[in-house]
Every structure is written in C-alpha cells, then in structure tokens.
Amino acid sequence: YDFTNCDFEKIKAAYLSTISKDLITYMSGTKSTEFNNTVSCSNRPHCLTEIQSLTFNPTAGCASLAKEMFAMKTKAALAIWCPGYSETQINATQAMKKARKSKVTTNKCLEQVSQLQGLWRRFNRPLLKQQGSSDYKDDDDKHHHHHH
C-alpha cells in the first residue's frame, strides 16, 4: 500500500490521543534504554510503511502484536485516513487470524514495540522545511510544511 495520500495530521491526532497511551501501557515496566532503535524512516509515508510492517507482520519471536489494542487502533486510523487502505488489508487480516490465537508478550515483542515508538515519534515530528529554505532533503513532505 502506498501511504502517500493519507491524511497525516489526522493519523497523528489519533496517535497522540489514544495509540501512544496504549503503547506506553504495553511497554510499562520497561526502561526506555533497554532496546536500541535500529528501524528508521525518512518521511511520513515511509514511516507508515514501517509502522504497518512492524505492527501487523508476524516476526520471529513476536507473532502476536496485531491483536493488541494499539494495533487495532492503528488499523482503524489507517483505514479511516488512508484512502483504499481497508481493501488492501482483507487478505492480510485472514492471514493474521490464522497466525495466532493468543496474546503473548515476549522480550522480542517489547523490542519491536520500542521500535514502533521511535517510528511514531519520527512520523509525528518530521523536521519540515519552511518556505524559502532549501536544507530539507525530503520532497515527499514538502506540502506538509505548515502542519508540523
């Protein structure tokens, strides 16, 4: 899915209002320095691509994130604010249901959610260029410069 046409500011609002709190709850008791952030993103569409991948794609050692509250709210936000997103996720949802029935919090999952927090932080606060400056290299975000 190409996230270019999403309403980034609405997704940001959804994240700040609810999703972030669910991530904090999931990570409660974990030190912020416990994991090194190795996943990064360069612009808002790219951040959403990485967020989707980490949230919904089962990985070795962590197959259960898709059933977490933050994941369900992320899915809802993307479905509402990204045109055509829901249609692309029907097959993925079926696969998810088959993949895992129970929620298990592993150290690998905690590490993955720590990565997610970094991706969301980057998504929310890209360094957007002002009109007239030329030091920002990310063309995908140019038209969002007034919605920092």
Epitope: A13, L16, T33, N37, S40, R121, N124, L127, D135, Y136
Partner: antibody, heavy 120, light 111 residues
Framework: EVQLVQSGAEVKKPGSSVKVSCKAS????????MHWVKHAPGQGLEWIGA????????SYNQKFKDRATLTVDKSTSTAYMELSSLRSEDTAVYYC?????????????WGQGTTVTVSS | DIVMTQSPDSLAVSLGERATINCRAS??????????MHWYQQKPGQPPKLLLY???NLGSGIPDRFSGSGSGTDFTLTISSLQAEDVAVYYC?????????FGQGTKLEIK
C-alpha cells in the same frame, strides 16, 4: 538517567565563531529531534533550529539560518551548534533540548545551558 | 511566523491566591482537533521546565495546582493556589508551524 550535558562558557570576539556541544546519555540519541534555543539577557526564549540525528536532517529558524550550523556525531551521541560571524547581540545562554518520547513536540530534557559572551 | 503574545508581562500574586497568565497566538495553533501549545516554567539560572503540553495536559511530576485551557489562538495558564516555589518566568510555546515560537515571558512574583 536521561541527560544532556553542554560545554562550558565561552568568551569570543566579534566576527569570530563559537561551537557549543551537547552530549546526550540515557536514551537512543539517533531517534529524537534535538533543538537549540537562545536566551539573551532580559529577553525571551528564541528557537534556533533542530536536527534529527538519525540522518542529520535539519530545520532552522530563518533568522539564524545564515549563521547557525547544527550537526551531530552519532558515535559520541553529541549534538553541536556553531554560530559564526558573532556580534554583541549573540551574547546569551544557549540551550540544547530533546523532544519528548511521544512526538508531542515539547522539550522534556534540557541541557544546563552554555553562556556565550561576545565582547571586543 | 506565528507571534505569541503573553499578558501580563509581570504579575504579583499573594501566596495561596490564584495566578492567571494568558497567551495569544497571531494565528491558530490547532491542527486536527489538537492544540499544539505548551507551557514552560523557568527559574533563575536554570533551563526551562515543561509544565503543560498540548494546552491542558500536565507534564510529568507537575503539581495539579497548575492547569491550562484554551484552543485556537487563546490560551490560559492558571495556578490555583500560588506557592513560594512558583516564583519564575512562564513561557508559552507553539509547535504547530515552523519556526517554533515562544511568548515573551511573564514574570510571576509574590505580592
């Protein structure tokens, strides 16, 4: 403990340059926007600019764009602010600050400040 | 640039009394239903400290005598019962649009 430790006070001549450092510890430096703020005597706070250590992207206040340069050294988790062509009105305390954990955009951790005095 | 104007410039309030500081933005700092306005407290010789984020959310470890309200262009910081340790300069900050801008500051003293 999450903290930012800045370099010591500097006294500079007009026309020269100053480079202030800000060493981060206790958090994953590369994933947080780092900001610089000026506080001149008897005046308010003024945003200079910000840098994302992950890839070095910067955003500047146009007022400082021609004279301020923000850089980072990821290997030492240090942010730098260089100010060139110094003049008397650059006399101020300069702070580095980290954006919050959640992308709210507030500055939750600040350095102790570096006093820069520009005098002939 | 969005200009942030605080009022008053200085304020003297008796201990235990209410203190109110206003901040007006030259244009709206709201986006998608959220107000991207923060408040800081700065004491002499110290860096600023976050008090409230997004207009009304209390920062970590901040006593609940501090509260904030407002949206769009008009915001208010209230201290319900002034304590001696609240003597400081208070700043509002908008982060909705680059460049990020602060108010000129309001100096709060004890009457």
């Amino acid at each position: 403990e999450v903290q930012l430790v800045q370099s010591g006070a500097e006294v500079k001549k007009p026309g020269s340059s100053v480079k202030v450092s800000c060493k981060a510890s206790g958090f994953t430096f590369s994933t947080y926007n780092m900001h610089w703020v000026k506080h001149a005597p008897g005046q308010g706070l003024e945003w200079i600019g910000a840098i994302y250590p992950g890839n070095g992207e910067t955003s500047y206040n146009q007022k400082f764009k021609d004279r301020a340069t923000l850089t980072v050294d990821k290997s030492t988790s240090t942010a730098y602010m260089e100010l060139s062509s110094l003049r008397s009105e650059d006399t101020a305390v300069y702070y580095c600050a980290r954006e919050d954990d959640y992308g709210e955009g507030y500055f939750d951790v600040w350095g102790q400040g570096t006093t820069v005095t520009v005098s002939s | 640039d969005i200009v942030m104007t605080q009022s008053p410039d200085s304020l003297a309030v008796s201990l235990g009394e209410r203190a109110t500081i206003n901040c007006r933005a030259s244009e709206s700092v709201d986006n998608s239903g959220l107000s991207f306005m923060h408040w800081y407290q700065q004491k002499p010789g110290q860096p600023p400290k976050l008090l409230l984020y997004r207009a009304s959310n209390l920062g970590s470890g901040i006593p609940d005598r501090f509260s904030g309200s407002g949206s769009g262009t008009d915001f208010t910081l209230t201290i319900s019962s002034l304590q001696a340790e609240d003597v400081a300069v208070y700043y509002c900050q908008q982060i909705n649009t680059d460049p990020l801008t602060f108010g000129q500051g309001t100096k709060l003293e004890i009457k």
